[in-house]
């Protein structure tokens, strides 16, 4: 299996944005790569977003996706937006080398993303 590395812990910003790098130990320069972000919480795994990209090109997620990303060599910089406290969980990076063959699959150990909902601003009198 292909080795995939990602940070153990990331804290989302007060605006509910979390970014992390997913790096894969490619055996060579794949021309087509698929990156999937999975969320594991309470022993359930759900797909957050996925993108297939050609090496040298930008990642393209679906228009309604909460993910954006850029690639550089064998690194993918992923950003997940719109996170709330209830979205806290383990976010796993899955990388597939789709072309040329043979197919390679790598799954990271996951990044624990902590999301803290911002405190509502108290009314202030001037």
């Amino acid at each position: 299996a292909m080795h995939v590395a990602q940070p153990a812990v990331v804290l989302a910003s007060s605006r509910g944005i979390a970014s992390f790098v997913c790096e894969y130990a490619s055996p060579g320069k794949a021309t087509e790569v698929r990156v999937t972000v999975l969320r594991q919480a309470d022993s359930q795994v759900t797909e957050v977003c996925a993108a297939t990209y050609m090496m040298g090109n930008e990642l393209t997620f679906l228009d309604d996706s909460i993910c954006t990303g850029t690639s550089s060599g064998n690194q993918v910089n992923l950003t997940i937006q719109g996170l709330r406290a209830m979205d806290t969980g383990l976010y796993i990076c899955k990388v597939e080398l789709m072309y040329p063959p043979p197919y390679y699959l790598g799954i990271g150990n996951g990044t624990q993303i902590y999301v803290i909902d911002p405190e509502p601003c108290p009314d202030s009198d001037f």
């Epitope: 320069k29 794949a30 040329p100």
Partner: antibody, heavy 118, light 107 residues
Framework: QVQLQESGPGLVKPSQTLSLTCAVS?????????WNWIRQPPGKGLEWIGY???????YYNPSLKSRVTMSVDTSKNQFSLKLSSVTAVDTAVYYC???????????WGQGTTVTVSS | EIVMTQSPATLSVSPGERATLSCKAS??????VAWYQQKPGQAPRPLIY???YRYSGIPARFSGSGSGTEFTLTISSLQSEDFAVYFC?????????FGQGTKLEIK
């Protein structure tokens, strides 16, 4: 696990064509990967000659391109190298090796020594 | 083509000591660098790929680092079986190229 084995004449006369074959076992050539030839002159470093792909595509080192031809025989699960108009500088150990496209070489043959001499 | 320059050409180290081998690329190759070990009469054996990842079965005393144009192979505590020739290899750009090798010998 994949194994590669080179074969061919150990002695070639100057101006003739060097012909080598690499037999692959434990993996079907047509399933993927790229199949390479690399050589090592006596006491020197490694020189990549080129590859032939699982799909028949190829790329040769520009320094040797005019003299190199590679082919693949999927029915015999082997690939071959032909190097024409050889001279003494082509004397080397010739290795066949496997890699992922533009990748490192994860499997090598044991190498076969070719001497160019009259 | 990309030229890979290894230094030193020969390195003399005592068993149990640390060995550091250098490889410089003539242009940026990202992290697409591998290292091989070759013993007399044998084919090269992959040690490290993608700059820092050990090939399967390679002991933890072998480690790789670097990016761009400068790369290092470190052997933390030399064993008798580690004395050999080491080659770096770039697979960022065709034609694929190798360094000229560093001979690691017993001091």
């Amino acid at each position: 696990q994949v194994q590669l084995q080179e074969s061919g004449p150990g002695l070639v006369k100057p101006s003739q064509t060097l012909s080598l074959t690499c037999a692959v076992s434990g993996y079907s050539i047509s399933s993927g990967y790229y199949w390479n030839w690399i050589r090592q002159p006596p006491g020197k470093g490694l020189e990549w000659i080129g590859y032939i792909g699982y799909d028949g595509s190829n790329y040769y080192n520009p320094s040797l391109k005019s003299r190199v031809t590679m082919s693949v025989d999927t029915s015999k699960n082997q690939f071959s190298l032909k190097l024409s108009s050889v001279t003494a500088v082509d004397t080397a150990v010739y290795y066949c090796a496997r890699n992922y496209y533009s990748g490192y070489f994860d499997s090598w043959g044991q190498g076969t020594t070719v001497t160019v001499s009259s | 083509e990309i030229v890979m320059t290894q230094s030193p050409a020969t390195l003399s180290v005592s068993p149990g000591e640390r060995a550091t081998l250098s490889c410089k690329a003539s242009q940026n190759v990202g992290t697409y660098v591998a290292w091989y070990q070759q013993k007399p009469g044998q084919a090269p054996r992959p040690l490290i790929y993608s700059t820092s990842y050990r090939y399967s079965g390679i002991p933890a005393r072998f480690s790789g680092s670097g990016s761009g144009t400068e790369f290092t192979l470190t052997i933390s505590s030399l064993q008798s079986e580690d004395f050999a020739v080491y080659f770096c290899h770039q697979y960022d750009t065709y034609p694929l190229t190798f360094g000229q090798g560093t001979k690691l010998e017993i001091k």
